[in-house]
């Protein structure tokens, strides 16, 4: 986990101000509106699961 302004988050994660930590880009599949998803350089999330 990285503080803002320090080294970037590891591959597959992006900084979340809401969570105050690096968050998994993979979770954008289920929660595409999370604040960190814009920072994820992955393809658009798969269809939302229920």
């Amino acid at each position: 986990e990285q503080a803002p302004g320090t080294a970037p988050c590891s591959r597959g994660s992006s900084w979340s101000a809401d969570l105050d930590k690096c968050a998994d880009c993979a979770s954008c599949r289920a929660r595409p509106h999370s604040d960190f998803c814009l920072g994820c350089a992955a393809a658009p999330p798969a269809p939302f699961r229920l």
Epitope: G12, D24, R29, R31, R49
Partner: antibody, heavy 119, light 111 residues
């Protein structure tokens, strides 16, 4: 540090009710989805119920085996959540864990509480 | 529901050797980018502890002796070299859809 402190559980007669509670600290509770997972020798680890966050309209989901019997709820102002269990049967016996997940994996876990349904 | 089948149910591995645990899902739990498979370790009297998320991503604080691989329906947890402290039961879990389901567990004994 992160803590999930559980209370409730014990012995209940078939057809009876029980309410489990879980108080969270050390993380942004309101942003997380919360679940109950139970464990028994017969069925192993079994996800029971989930309640999502305010941004997901507090949506709830249940395992088919507990639909209509169990109700999950949360109180973000006090960082706690609950499992109300009604019409309990012997097959509901097990260790119940509260757990948090941002979306996919169960990250933080409570210490577990035993529920025994028996006459 | 997606059925998670773990093999073997138990195994004994000599100290310092490799332990390999397999988990097969009854349908694919992967997109082109990520696999929605996770691994946990559970010791007696304790809750499960997250080891690996998204098939291969090591959880913070977990020793690099643990590694995960696989995609689609077939996944593997490797522990190498095994240590005494690794005596536990290991579980896989998918988060592809609701209901989330777990494998039946693999009990690891260190010889």
């Amino acid at each position: 540090q992160v803590q999930l402190q559980q209370s409730g559980g014990g012995l209940v007669q078939p057809g009876g009710s029980m309410k489990l509670s879980c108080i969270a600290s050390g993380f942004t509770f309101s942003s997380y989805w919360m679940s109950w997972v139970r464990q028994s020798p017969e069925k192993g680890l079994e996800w029971v119920a989930e309640i999502r966050s305010k941004s997901d309209n507090y949506a709830t989901h249940y395992a088919e085996s507990v639909k209509g019997k169990f109700t999950i709820s949360r109180d973000d102002s006090k960082s706690r959540f609950f499992l109300q269990m009604n019409n309990l049967r012997a097959e509901d016996t097990g260790i119940y864990y509260c757990s948090s997940t941002y979306a996919d994996y169960f990250h933080y876990w409570g210490q577990g509480t035993d529920l025994t349904v028996s006459s | 529901d997606i059925v998670m089948t773990q093999t073997p149910a138990s195994l004994a591995v000599s100290l310092g050797q490799r332990a390999t645990i397999s988990c097969r899902a009854s349908q694919s739990v992967s997109t082109s980018t990520y696999s929605y498979m996770h691994w946990y370790q559970q010791k007696p009297g304790q809750p499960p502890k997250l080891l690996i998320k998204y098939a291969s991503s090591l959880e913070s604080g977990v020793p690099a002796r643990f590694s995960g691989s696989g995609s689609g329906t077939d996944f593997t947890l490797n522990i190498h070299p095994v240590e005494e402290d690794d005596t536990a039961t290991y579980y896989c879990q998918h988060s592809w859809e609701i209901p989330y389901t777990f494998g039946g567990g693999t009990k690891l004994e260190i010889k």
